[in-house]
Amino acid sequence: PPNRRTCVFFEAPGVRGSTKTLGELLDTGTELPRAIRCLYSRCCFGIWNLTQDRAQVEMQGCRDSDEPGCESLHCDPSPRAHPSPGSTLFTCSCGTDFCNANYSHLPPPGSPGTPGSQGPQAAPGESIWMAL
């Protein structure tokens, strides 16, 4: 399809690496949220860190290619990694403009489908890229 995908763009302070080069940041006239127009895919992604009491966004932006999950209309995160005990990284991919702004739902920590508490452990920056 000819039209390019536009996604929400965000990178939490301290996150190593950047996906900024996967698109062109847009001037939306507001400070936040930032928007990015994808160069190499029609697919947005989001990564959230779910702890016992809250979900915190880690990264949002464009994927570098279209792959399974990108056909989704909405952001339906799935568990990917354990950056530290008691927290889980959830990621989504989706294929409509700004679909990565928010997730539709997150399963509670420790629920079926969440990696076990002995799942992969990684340093915070590394775990983001594991999730991607």
Partner: antibody, heavy 117, light 111 residues
């Protein structure tokens, strides 16, 4: 600084495959950017043919998609164009170009390819 | 594909003249208020050179006598005071939709 240099035969016979290579210096083609091919028939305008991205994904102009292939050799920091079943209408100056965004800031000097028997 | 129509196709001007070249797209090249229209200069036997990106942003190293404006479907490249080295052909390019497409060019000649 980033430089691009096209190379390949200047004469190709009708129905054969045109093959060109672009050698990139001063920058790794796997670091960033899209690596494009753009052509310009003599005395005419510019036509974007397609790109290969830093990650290896490709995108082609639908008007050429059935005939064009762009690939890369990361060990040589090169990317290549193949255009099959050429005709006289494919006679053009062929440019390789690097783009961080969706416009073309870095160009090779161009190479003329003539299709003739 | 988005068709890009430049006018005029050629023009004659003198050093010091103000020159305006227009480019009209067959449909809007804006995304959420951002215009994906770019301008290049090409001299005979040379590769095109980027002048303006995203409608109005001057590429590094390009003289300030070049400026761009417009949004939607209608865009303009202006040379405020034509210099001898500005005699060349100018092309617009849109990147709002795939495939990227260029205008047919405007040749600026010496009067």
């Amino acid at each position: 600084q980033l430089q691009l240099q096209e190379s390949g035969p200047g004469l190709v016979k009708p129905s054969e495959t045109l093959s060109l290579t672009c050698t990139v210096s001063g920058y790794s083609i796997t670091s960033d950017f899209a690596w494009n091919w753009i052509r310009q028939p003599p005395g005419k305008g510019l036509e974007w043919m397609g790109y290969i991205s830093f990650s290896g994904s490709t995108s082609y102009n639908p008007s050429l998609k059935s005939r064009v292939t762009i690939s890369r050799d990361t060990s040589k920091n090169q990317f290549s164009l193949k255009l099959s079943s050429v005709t006289a209408a494919d006679t053009a100056v062929y440019y390789c170009a690097g783009s961080r965004y969706s416009w073309f800031a870095y160009w090779g000097q161009g190479t003329l390819v003539t299709v003739s028997s | 594909d988005i068709q890009m129509t430049q006018s005029p196709s050629s023009l004659s001007a003198s050093v010091g003249d103000r020159v305006t070249i227009t480019c009209r797209a067959s449909e809007s090249v804006d995304t959420y208020g951002n215009s994906f229209m770019h301008w290049y200069q090409q001299k005979p036997g040379k590769a095109p050179k980027l002048l303006i990106y995203r409608a109005s942003n001057l590429e590094s190293g390009v003289p300030s006598r070049f400026s761009g404006s417009g949004s939607g479907t209608d865009f303009t490249l202006t040379i405020s005071s034509l210099q001898p080295e500005d005699f060349a052909t100018y092309y617009c390019q849109q990147s709002n939709e795939d495939p990227y497409t260029f205008g047919g060019g405007t040749k600026v000649e010496i009067k």
